[in-house]
Amino acid sequence: RAVPGGSSPAWTQCQQLSQKLCTLAWSAHPLVGHMDLREEGDEETTNDVPHIQCGDGCDPQGLRDNSQFCLQRIHQGLIFYEKLLGSDIFTGEPSLLPDSPVGQLHASLLGLSQLLQPEGHHWETQQIPSLSPSQPWQRLLLRFKILRSLQAFVAVAARVFAHGAATLSP
């Protein structure tokens, strides 16, 4: 687990859970409702969602030097998306099907974030900017956009954990 002082997370566990997240994110994406792509804005909502960027220390060298920076960034993103998936955007109307993978996705995001941050230690989490509340007519597009950006986020996280499991595990 990633704890203050530079301890390593359970890389293999994180790798397995992040791979599961990738699968769930892709399976949830087409199930959030009919999406007319013409409704999308020209801009992406890049300011609204967390991204793993070059300066976040998630490259192989950065992970070797100090994995905490990258892990904190991943943790922030996981919490961000976990909150979104628990918000009225996903829980409100139009209702998701009872067997929708979104519920599993939500639980897995929480599970991986807890692997990265044990109780008693609190990393600063990113605020959710004006993404809630919403009305039903807005939600299909919001779900679509959020899941699409989540796919990209968990894909990068999975690569980080795969690298960590292969090269940084004790």
Partner: antibody, heavy 122, light 107 residues
């Protein structure tokens, strides 16, 4: 006092362009979705377009898709509607609106501007 | 698209009358419906939101009911200032759609 003030309407020839503006005051503009609604003379209300607080998500009525573009400048507290390839059937009073009802907010805003008239005619 | 059908298109009534306007959605919209009042040359004014919630500052003689596809706006005792056009509007899915309007006229 929450206020919306539209401008930019006028007479334009078919195929022409206009840009409407809506200046907002009295509330935190960047927190809220905004929209445009229009009303042809003697007719009912028609929703035109909406935009998410960040500006990154937009919605349009089929009748204006590909011709109209909604945008906002949160630093200027201003909402815009760029209207291209205008047709006679776009002739209407255009209202800018802030409508938060039903969205789980405690503050139920439903504020409309006074409207700006757009006439498309040769 | 969800069609909103309002009836009647116009109604003649006297001060003190009870007036009922109905709105039917072409598919279920839960309670995502609002009622607006509009007077000539003015912007619409919200009366009722979420099918039955009275907007702040709106007199209690206005009330809304219904869920799913059938909705009603009732004015319990018509006042002189209530002569106007009334619109219903759904916000369940895009495009957001309004009813055709009901004109309440003086008998």
């Amino acid at each position: 006092e929450v206020q919306l003030l539209e401008s930019g309407g006028g007479l334009v020839q078919p195929g022409g362009s206009l840009r409407l503006s809506c200046a907002a005051s009295g509330f935190t503009f960047s927190k809220y979705s905004m929209e445009w609604v229009r009303q042809a003379p003697g007719k009912g209300l028609e929703w035109v377009s909406s935009i998410w607080p960040s500006g990154g998500l937009t919605w349009y009525a089929d009748s204006v898709k590909g011709r109209f573009t909604i945008s906002r400048d949160n630093s200027k507290n201003t909402l815009y509607l760029q209207m291209n390839s205008l047709r006679a059937e776009d002739t209407a009073m255009y209202y800018c609106a802030l409508r938060t009802w039903g969205s789980g907010n405690n503050d139920v805003f439903d504020i409309w501007g006074q409207g700006t008239m757009v006439t498309v005619s040769s | 698209d969800i069609q909103m059908t309002q009836s009647p298109s116009s109604v003649s009534a006297s001060v003190g009358d009870r007036v009922t306007i109905t709105c039917r959605a072409s598919q279920g919209i839960s309670s995502w419906l609002a009622w607006y009042q509009q007077k000539p040359g003015k912007a619409p004014k919200l009366l009722i939101y979420a099918a039955s919630s009275l907007q702040s500052g709106v007199p209690s003689r206005f009330s809304g009911s219904g869920s799913g596809t059938d909705f009603t706006l009732t004015i319990s005792s018509l006042q002189p200032e209530d002569f106007a056009t009334y619109y219903c509007q759904q916000s369940y899915s895009t495009p957001l759609t309004f009813g055709g309007g009901t004109r309440v006229e003086i008998k």
